[in-house]
């Protein structure tokens, strides 16, 4: 599940990791674009082992994964993509 949120909250991530997470371990991904109280883009990953991690948006593996998910979401493949706009 890929989610893009636009929020007015401050930054959520207090530390970021570049460590690769295999897709089979990922339950959900949330993207928080920069702005509205946080000067940087944030990517939050929920893992299937009930842990949660902020991923460095510059990490190559997450950029590749985002691109794959975007492509799938614009095709007919059944990969749910949620884009929620929160005022």
């Amino acid at each position: 599940v890929l989610e893009v949120y636009y929020t007015s909250l401050r930054c959520r991530c207090v530390q970021e990791s570049s460590v690769f997470i295999p897709r089979r371990f990922i339950d959900r991904i949330q993207i928080l674009p920069r702005g509205n109280g946080c000067p940087r883009k944030e990517i939050i990953v929920w893992k299937k082992n009930k842990s949660i991690v902020c991923v460095d948006p510059q990490a190559e593996w997450i950029q590749r994964m985002m691109e794959v998910l975007r492509k799938r979401s614009s095709s007919t493949l059944p990969v749910p993509v949620f884009k929620r706009k929160i005022p």
Partner: antibody, heavy 122, light 107 residues
């Protein structure tokens, strides 16, 4: 406002099964990311994590007690449960339930119940 | 399992003193550490999360730091209301493990 409250038998005998209930409000265990954990504290000693249960019924146990622990939930009644079989005097402690929410920043056990004192005595 | 070695087990300090409590992790926990305060007869409450971040409503005299595998809670100027037990918790991996606790008393 998040609140949790534990209930249990108070006193029980060795070899019996301890059944604890955590009744909570202000959140739902059907919401993505929500969990409830159990922690105990013998009088005058430190805290020991026992088990967690999550919104999707995923369960985690302390391996030192795993074969004696069962955690479960009743989502519709906002309750979580812990059973400990074959109790011994070493299980005498105050038992707490606490909420965890998988959000960033992640602070496990951000809200706690008041605790329930359990004594195992013959 | 990750072991959390907390020291001291108890200490006595005077009002205004600088107080430091330490937990040492047996494996890398990458800042996945919380400090809880537990006042007598009460439930624990989180004070510091992710090793260095102050929880809501916690006075600024409290701070957290890390040096390698050692994680510390410091009270810059002790006040009477700080008399309590303090516990560290690692949540890097299951099973979650607590330190043995530190009882902080006022001289």
């Amino acid at each position: 406002q998040v609140t949790l409250k534990e209930s249990g038998p108070g006193i029980l005998q060795p070899s019996q099964t301890l059944s604890l209930t955590c009744t909570f409000s202000g959140f739902s265990l059907s919401t993505y990311g929500m969990g409830v954990g159990w922690i105990r504290q013998p009088s005058g000693k430190g805290l020991e994590w026992l088990a967690n249960i999550w919104w999707d019924d995923d369960k985690y146990y302390n391996p030192s007690l795993q074969n004696r622990l069962t955690i479960s939930k009743d989502t519709s009644n906002n309750q979580a449960f812990l059973k400990i079989t074959n109790v011994d005097t070493a299980d005498t402690a105050t038992y707490y339930c606490a909420r965890s929410e998988l959000i960033m920043p992640y602070v496990p056990f951000d809200y706690w119940g008041q605790g329930v004192r359990v004594t195992v005595s013959s | 399992d990750i072991q959390m070695t907390q020291s001291p087990s108890s200490m006595s300090a005077s009002l205004g003193d600088r107080v430091t409590i330490t937990c040492q992790a047996s494996q890398d926990i990458d800042n996945h550490l919380i400090w809880f305060q537990q006042k007598p007869g009460k439930s624990p409450r989180p004070m510091i999360y992710y090793a260095t971040n102050l929880a809501n409503g916690v006075p600024s005299r409290f701070s957290g730091s890390r040096s390698g595998s050692d994680y510390s809670l410091t009270i810059s100027s002790l006040e009477s209301e700080d008399m309590a037990d303090y516990h560290c918790l690692q949540f890097k991996q299951y099973p979650f493990t607590f330190g043995s606790g530190t009882k902080l008393e006022i001289k």
